[in-house]
Interface confidence: low
């Protein structure tokens, strides 16, 4: 049987029954159970650093008589490479440094073989080499760098983050893998629970506005933290998050702005800014006007981007009424944390002084435009109407009026510079120009730069000052053989006037021609008249041309009339009434021209 000389034999069992004995780094004695052997493991120290091979143990067979007839063979995990056996002596050695963390157990098989026959002299036996742990691994954190946040002003003991370190050494043997956490950097602000790695706040009233970033270094040490233990570290970057623990504060107690009195409502006139050491919504500020004589004259709005208060004009200002306003403006946090109210009110006030600057405003006319009327027969210096302008400034500065001569080159109109009365300076004629469009200027007497203009539309009203006239020059003819009451010409008249009820003309022969005339005028009562023959037949040799004076009158007031002359020639005609010859015999007989008889 193979045996290990150093092993204790269990009494009562004959030696020949033993299969194989081991000696060396075995921890406990082998025990037999019927015919099979339970081999206790060899324990081999890991990370052996000696210069020689590390001795593991010895195999021995009872059949070995020391004559070299037996050969020991090793097979299994690492046999021939990690583990070698002296085939003559059965000594086993480890050739390399072993690392338990790489492989903690090796299973090998041993055999004793007859060199001559090459046959085993014993059955093959299996045994274990267990690598014995040494503390050769330091704890390693799951992260090289942790980041965490915690609200500022947190109570002591507030959870921040948990760090974890692992140790590759054997947790079942000794304290090589028993990790204890401690804080190397970050006191007195933070603490770490030694067993859990939980980091907590350790200082009261940690203020983000004072310091926002903390770098905490945590150590994990094995051997339960005892001397000689290995350690690893990690960095925890902790950021204090903001809470609203700071009220807004105005950097100055008083602000002054200037604004012209002409600023329309809504005009921004200045910006004020309260500072708040907090950030985000905790630094949001609302501004309001809480007091002051300008409470109803100004507004303050909050610029959400810059957190500034913009003072704006609310109502129209009047320098002449008030030139300085003082306001009390308040800046407050809309998001307040009740637990910090003991620190005082989360608002601040400042005085805003607003100086209203004078703007000298031009005069303002009572109308945007004036429409006036005047009869065309108005005498020079007739008043047409008047314009009014006032200085809008409280003083009601006096104004003077003038006509813009670019709009009245002919100086037809004039204006009283003091009272704004418009009057004529020339005679008018509606028939020449119906509308006069002029511009009047109002200027502040004491400040000629301040002036305003207004259009005047002057309508010239019609007066019946034009007589009706023939619409054209009438030259007609009559056939020698014409019959009495024959229409030889229709007359029309025109009148430059424009009477309200329309034209109504009347036509008649002039009194001096009416009696004994060879022609008559028939008024058609439709502003036309006809010339009719008064006798049968005309002799062109007796009278070749008649000049008929026709009086045309209108029926407006005062009645206007004019006399127009119609020339009637006596002509020879064919039986259809077409002219054949119509000579001006009058040139031969000057006495032949007649007004009609």
């Amino acid at each position: 049987t193979l045996s290990t000389p150093l092993s204790k034999r269990t009494s009562g069992f004959p030696a020949k029954k033993r299969a194989l004995e081991l000696s060396g780094n075995s921890k406990n004695e082998l025990s037999r159970s019927k015919r099979s052997w339970m081999w206790n493991q060899f324990f081999l120290l890991e990370e052996y650093t000696g210069s020689d091979y590390q001795y593991v143990g010895k195999l021995h067979s009872d059949q070995d008589r020391g004559d070299g007839s037996l050969k020991y063979i090793l097979s299994g995990d690492g046999a021939g490479d990690l583990f070698i056996i002296n085939e003559n002596t059965g000594d086993i050695q480890a050739t390399k440094r072993l690392d338990r963390e790489e492989k903690p157990v090796y299973i090998l098989r041993a055999q004793a073989i007859n060199r001559r026959t090459g046959r085993p002299v014993e059955p093959e036996s299996e045994f274990i080499i267990k690598i014995h742990d040494i503390n050769d691994n330091e704890p390693i954190f799951t992260k090289e760098v942790y980041t965490a946040t915690v609200p500022e002003m947190s109570d002591v003991g507030t959870f921040v983050v948990q760090v974890t370190a692992t140790d590759a050494d054997d947790p079942t043997y000794g304290n090589s893998a028993k990790v204890v956490y401690s804080i190397l950097q970050g006191q007195p602000y933070f603490s770490v629970e030694s067993e859990t790695g939980i980091i907590k706040t350790a200082l009261l009233n940690m203020d983000r506005e004072n310091r926002e970033q903390y770098q905490v270094v945590i150590q994990a040490k094995d051997m339960g933290g005892q001397m000689g233990g290995l350690s690893g570290t990690t960095t925890v970057n902790i950021t204090l998050t903001d809470v609203n623990d700071n009220p807004p504060r105005f950097p100055q107690s008083t602000y002054q702005f200037k604004t012209p009195e002409s600023s329309p409502p809504g005009t921004p006139i200045g910006r004020i800014k309260a500072s708040d050491a907090d950030v985000g919504e905790n630094a949001e500020i609302e501004y309001s006007i809480t007091d002051g004589e300008g409470l109803d004259m100004f507004d303050v709005i909050t610029d959400q981007e810059t957190q500034e208060g913009i003072i704006t004009v609310k109502k129209l200002l009047d320098f002449e009424k008030k030139k300085v306003y003082t306001l009390k403006v308040e800046a407050s946090n809309p998001h307040v944390e009740p637990r910090f109210l003991y620190l005082g009110p989360f608002k601040d006030s400042a005085t805003v002084r607003i100086v209203v600057e004078d703007v000298d405003e031009p005069p303002v006319f009572s109308k945007l435009a004036y429409i006036l009327q005047i009869r065309e027969d108005a005498q020079i210096n007739t008043t047409i109407g008047s314009v009014t302008a006032q200085d809008p400034d409280a003083a009601r500065n006096p104004v003077k009026y003038s006509v813009d001569r670019h709009t009245d080159m002919d100086r037809i109109f004039n204006i009283d510079s003091g009272n704004g009365s418009i009057f004529t300076s020339k005679l008018l004629d509606r028939e020449t120009l119906l509308w006069h469009n002029i511009t009047v200027i109002a200027t502040e007497i004491n400040n000629p730069k301040q002036s305003s203009r207004v259009p005047l539309y002057i309508k010239v009203l019609d007066v019946n000052d034009n007589a009706p006239e023939f619409a054209e020059f009438y030259e007609t003819f009559v056939c020698e053989k014409a019959k009495a009451d024959q229409l030889i010409q229709t007359l029309r008249a025109v009148d430059k006037d424009d009477p309200y009820s329309g034209h109504q003309f009347s036509f008649s022969l002039a009194p001096e021609a009416a009696s004994g005339s060879n022609f008559t005028i028939q008024d058609n009562k439709d502003n036309t008249a006809g010339i009719l023959t008064r006798k049968n037949g005309y002799n062109r040799h007796e009278m070749s041309t008649y000049l008929l004076p026709v009086v045309i009158s209108d029926n407006d007031y005062p009645v206007q009339s004019s006399t127009g002359t119609v020339t009637v020639r006596v002509c020879a005609c064919d039986h259809h009434g077409n002219m054949q010859s119509c000579h001006a015999e009058a040139l031969i007989h000057p006495t032949g021209l007649s007004t009609g008889a």
Partner: antibody, heavy 123, light 107 residues
Framework: EVQLQQSGPELVKPGDSVKMSCKAS????????MAWVRQSHRKSLEWIGY????????DYSQKFKGKATLTVDKSSSTVYMELHSLTSEDSAVYYC????????????????WGQGTSVSVSS | DIQMTQSPASLSASVGETVTITCRAS??????LAWYQQKQGKSPQLLVY???LLADGVPSRFSGSGSGTQYSLKINSLKSEDVARYYC?????????FGSGTKLEIK
């Protein structure tokens, strides 16, 4: 040289009114405010109000509203103050004073003063 | 109205000395303060405005200082012609008001 020439002393009866003048020269009259201040033994110096000659705009101390009326005649560069319903309490020296220009932003500081008009109210 | 409290009511100093007159406002007037000098039988004269600025023609031995509600007028190297009554006046808002005056005499 800026000069403010005030009218002479006045002796008036209680209940009467008095109108005093202040003629300005040596500067652009319409560009500067004119304030009125009274000085009595009892009350030190008291600001009455101002008038802006360019526009005629006025402002009065609450105490003097209804008591004083300020007017201006630009053609003569003269400012007037009329005091109404006089009592012995109104006996004082009344000064007109030109305010600093608006360029200073210091409207109510007064850099030139008239010689004062003495008003005595006595029955 | 804003009250102006001036002190002392009177003081006496020797030629060449330095004197200081103080003025307290009942609320913050943000340096809107003027100092006037009034000699016997004369009209007041502006010395200082905006708390610290010397008016035209005022000797440099006069100086103004202060802020908020507390202001002072300092006269260095006192001269006999400085005998007068001195008034402070705020013009922060309407109505401007004056202090009760400080009478300065020469010993």
């Amino acid at each position: 040289e800026v000069q403010l020439q005030q009218s002479g002393p006045e002796l008036v009866k209680p209940g009467d009114s008095v109108k005093m003048s202040c003629k300005a020269s040596g500067y652009t009259f319409t560009d500067y405010y004119m304030a009125w201040v009274r000085q009595s033994h009892r009350k030190s110096l008291e600001w009455i109000g101002y008038i802006f000659p360019n526009s005629g705009g006025t402002d009065y101390s609450q105490k003097f509203k209804g008591k004083a009326t300020l007017t201006v005649d630009k053609s003569s560069s003269t400012v007037y103050m009329e005091l109404h319903s006089l009592t012995s309490e109104d006996s004082a020296v009344y000064y007109c004073a030109r305010e600093l220009g608006a360029d200073y932003g210091d409207y109510y500081a007064m850099d030139h003063w008239g010689q004062g008009t003495s008003v005595s109210v006595s029955s | 109205d804003i009250q102006m409290t001036q002190s002392p009511a009177s003081l006496s100093a020797s030629v060449g000395e330095t004197v200081t007159i103080t003025c307290r406002a009942s609320e913050n007037i943000d340096s809107y303060l003027a100092w006037y000098q009034q000699k016997q039988g004369k009209s007041p004269q502006l010395l200082v405005y905006s708390a610290t600025l010397l008016a035209d023609g005022v000797p440099s031995r006069f100086s103004g200082s202060g802020s908020g509600t507390q202001y002072s007028l300092k006269i260095n190297s006192l001269k006999s012609e400085d005998v007068a009554r001195y008034y402070c006046q705020h013009y922060y808002r309407t109505p401007p008001t004056f202090g009760s005056g400080t009478k300065l005499e020469i010993k």
